[in-house]
Amino acid sequence: LIIGFGISGKHFITVTTFTSAGNIGEDGTLSCTFEPDIKLNGIVIQWLKEGIKGLVHEFKEGKDDLSQQHEMFRGRTAVFADQVVVGNASLRLKNVQLTDAGTYTCYIRTSKGKGNANLEYKTGAFSMPEINVDYNASSESLRCEAPRWFPQPTVAWASQVDQGANFSEVSNTSFELNSENVTMKVVSVLYNVTINNTYSCMIENDIAKATGDIKVTDSEVKRRSQLQLLNSG
């Protein structure tokens, strides 16, 4: 969470941004809020990126003005125009690329004053893992798959029954490059699993951490997955 202040005459306005992460190839949002101002035509929003000449996006007089926009962002950005008067300057970013990572500035000018705040935007790939029982194996085993990760993550297994156990000797993890030659498919197999136990497959890089849980009993298989972005907020 980054809060910036600005001065215009005697007036400060508070601008707040949140560090966030973008999933490459998907659409993302760079979050920025400011003190609301009912006078829409007097609000100017400018998004800038460190190291880039030209603007990422500009919104003024109630509409976009992209005449100064850098070409790498052409056709890829939008503010939530109907939410500007309530203080939302967040930026939608289409088809996130690795090169979108960096430091952004959200600059605001209203009839009340002006202010800005920086935002660190990380880019990578992250996806939910899915665990299945591998019945083809000679012994009972579990297969954990996640379709898109970048940078290359670490993979670890844990179990409810054998808490603290090291499963690296009884698991095998591989990373397969996807067709776009950036992201990778993660596959990890855990061997010699036992019935009536809950196993967790944990995939983590510097952007996100994902966990898939599976509970195998004689009568059913229960699964659960979750994903959290790291260092956000």
């Epitope: 190839g25 056709g75 088809n95």
Partner: antibody, heavy 119, light 107 residues
Framework: QVQLQESGPGLVKPSETLSLTCTVS????????WSWIRQPPGKGLEWIGY???????NNNPSLKSRVTISVDTSKNQFSLKLISVTAADTAVYYC?????????????WGQGTLVTVSS | EIVMTQSPATLSVSPGERATLSCRAS??????LAWYQQKPGQAPRLLIY???TRATGIPARFSGSGSGTEFTLTIRSLQSEDFAVYYC?????????FGGGTKLEIK
């Protein structure tokens, strides 16, 4: 109500230059992106390229560097030039407005003009 | 470039029934997809953008769904004026690309 009207010759000789102009009425050319799209007879649609009122453009790589799109804000017009045409460039050429700066659907279209490339 | 594939090429449906048209992208386009209707001798007409948002003035019987690589345009209770060619178009990446079209004809 925004209206678009294509104009230009309907017949162009092979190896020559195809030139079309789109006149926008009922609204300003500023604040929107504008595109050219073509459709060969009996076939599907192909995006040619876009222009913004500030003059920034982007073209379909399939047309290599044969395409030039320009804008004249004082006349509320934008134009297409396609050099070194062949019979494969025979198509109905449409000009269209991009719906908004993020959702690149085309909400207003000209009626289209058929350009035939033939000697 | 992203290749858009529409199926079927021709769909025969009776008036009053439901038509389901499919569009598949060669890679994920998120929700950055539009649908158009084109009648003979006319320019295409924008029906749907953002995969599921109806454009201004488009009747509620038209609905779009899907994200990623699989998309569907559904027209319920077909009217006589709905028989036309339908195109999908992605705007996730340059160049913008269209599908080959689905011709919706009267059964």
């Amino acid at each position: 109500q925004v209206q678009l009207q294509e104009s230009g010759p309907g017949l162009v000789k092979p190896s020559e230059t195809l030139s079309l102009t789109c006149t926008v009425s009922g609204g300003s050319i500023s604040s929107y992106y504008w595109s050219w799209i073509r459709q060969p007879p009996g076939k599907g649609l192909e995006w040619i390229g876009y222009i913004y009122y500030s003059g920034s453009t982007n073209n379909n790589p399939s047309l290599k560097s044969r395409v030039t799109i320009s804008v004249d804000t004082s006349k509320n017009q934008f134009s297409l030039k396609l050099i070194s045409v062949t019979a494969a460039d025979t198509a109905v050429y449409y000009c269209a407005r991009v719906y908004n700066n993020y959702d690149w659907g085309f909400d207003y279209w000209g009626q289209g003009t058929l350009v035939t490339v033939s000697s | 470039e992203i290749v858009m594939t529409q199926s079927p090429a021709t769909l025969s449906v009776s008036p009053g029934e439901r038509a389901t048209l499919s569009c598949r992208a060669s890679q994920s386009v998120s929700s950055n997809l539009a649908w158009y209707q084109q009648k003979p001798g006319q320019a295409p007409r924008l029906l749907i953008y953002g995969a599921s948002t109806r454009a201004t003035g488009i009747p509620a019987r038209f609905s779009g769904s899907g994200s990623g690589t699989e998309f569907t345009l559904t027209i319920r209770s077909l009217q006589s004026e709905d028989f036309a060619v339908y195109y999908c178009q992605q705007y996730h990446n340059w160049p913008l690309t269209f599908g080959g079209g689905t011709k919706l004809e009267i059964k």
